[in-house]
């Protein structure tokens, strides 16, 4: 028995920040779980972890240097990534493990979300074209 995960196929991070919502076919209320976001086709980089416990405050952390926050819904976890770099454009996968109460459950691998990071390009504005050559 596996949890199904739905993610947007693609998101664009215009201001080097993005909200990625992971929607699960499972109610996380009163469960102890570990939701995580992984970068790359091989999911090699664990970008962010949201640890939920029935008795404690939500714990959100990254051990890989990402600036992340997390928000919990009944059947979703939303990861808020900030300060993304253009070279972090990649495919990102949501993962969920429900530990308590048993039985342990995890998810079928999702299709992932391509996050396209558009950097802040310092282009001259048409109204303020900048200094012109004499």
């Amino acid at each position: 028995n596996k949890i199904l995960v739905k993610q947007s196929p693609m998101l664009v991070a215009y201001d080097n920040a993005v909200n990625l919502s992971c929607k699960y076919s499972y109610n996380l209320f009163s469960r102890e779980f570990r939701a995580s976001l992984h970068k790359g086709l091989d999911s090699a980089v664990e970008v962010c972890v949201v640890y939920g416990n029935y008795s404690q405050q939500l714990q959100v952390y990254s051990k890989t240097g990402f600036n992340c926050d997390g928000k919990l819904g009944n059947e979703s976890v939303t990861f808020y990534l900030q300060n993304l770099y253009v070279n972090q454009t990649d495919i990102y996968f949501c993962k969920i493990e429900v530990m308590y109460p048993p039985p342990y459950l995890d998810n079928e691998k999702s299709n992932g979300t391509i996050i396209h990071v558009k950097g802040k390009h310092l282009c001259p504005s048409p109204l303020f074209p900048g200094p012109s050559k004499p």
Epitope: Y54, P103, Y104
Partner: antibody
Framework: EVQLVESGGGLVQPGGSLRLSCAAS??????????VSWIRQAPGKGLEWIGS???????YYNPSLKSRVTISRDNSKNTLYLQLNSLRAEDTAVYYC????????????WGQGTLVTVSS | DIQLTQSPSSLSASVGDRVTITCRAS??????????LHWYQQKPGKAPKLLIY???SLQSGVPSRFSGSGSGTDFTLTISSLQPEDFATYYC?????????FGQGTKVEIK
């Protein structure tokens, strides 16, 4: 046949660290459906759960020990490890590794245990 | 944390006696009709051995004289006819919540 064999116990100085090993055979530590925990038992006392590792590599710890303990594994050796830091006399115990299945989390197979004595 | 309290802490019994040990949890360990409460036997110098899982299911290879019952917060381990090899310490354990906790143990001694 499922087997768990602990090693690495012995005499350790207070303030020191220990690293115990648990070699598993008869099943794979990375196969979905089973996890392994470390459990300890002080001389003449009851059983205390230290923490668990799931097939995915996710770890869970007893909050009373969390700041001092790390559970890890080497899939190529099918071996589990327990690192415990800042040891004190009350950490003197027999340390067991035990397997559990994902249905009920009951510990169905146990190692023979390894004794750790913390003393100067 | 879920506290498990076993009673009695120790008991003396004779071969052939019916023995009952109780385990009370500080909160329910039931979830969707399953009780996440297990019983172990431990002999001196040996590792614990699983006897009963999920309150009443007999672990493979365990003699049928061992049985478990109960739900919610109150559980019982029964040995219908005590055998010489049954003199040991018995522990209950819950796996409903983390941290997983054990009862303090019940020592069954020869009368």
């Amino acid at each position: 046949e499922v087997q768990l064999v602990e090693s690495g116990g012995g005499l350790v100085q207070p303030g020191g660290s220990l690293r115990l090993s648990c070699a598993a055979s008869g099943f794979s530590l990375s196969t979905s459906g089973v996890g392994v925990s470390w459990i300890r038992q002080a001389p003449g006392k009851g059983l205390e759960w230290i923490g668990s590792i799931y097939h995915s590599g996710s770890t869970y710890y007893n909050p009373s020990l969390k700041s001092r303990v790390t559970i890890s594994r080497d899939n190529s050796k099918n071996t589990l490890y327990l690192q415990l830091n800042s040891l004190r006399a009350e950490d003197t115990a027999v340390y067991y590794c035990a397997r559990y299945e994902y249905d009920y989390y009951a510990f169905d197979y146990w190692g023979q245990g390894t004794l750790v004595t913390v003393s100067s | 944390d879920i506290q498990l309290t076993q009673s009695p802490s120790s008991l003396s019994a004779s071969v052939g006696d019916r023995v009952t040990i109780t385990c009370r949890a500080s909160q329910s360990v039931d979830f969707y009709g399953i009780s996440f409460l297990h019983w172990y036997q431990q002999k001196p110098g040996k590792a614990p051995k699983l006897l009963i899982y999920a309150a009443s299911s007999l672990q493979s290879g365990v003699p049928s004289r061992f049985s478990g019952s109960g739900s919610g917060t109150d559980f019982t381990l029964t040995i219908s006819s005590l055998q010489p090899e049954d003199f040991a310490t018995y522990y209950c354990q819950q796996s409903y919540r983390t941290p997983r906790t054990f009862g303090q143990g019940t020592k069954v001694e020869i009368k």
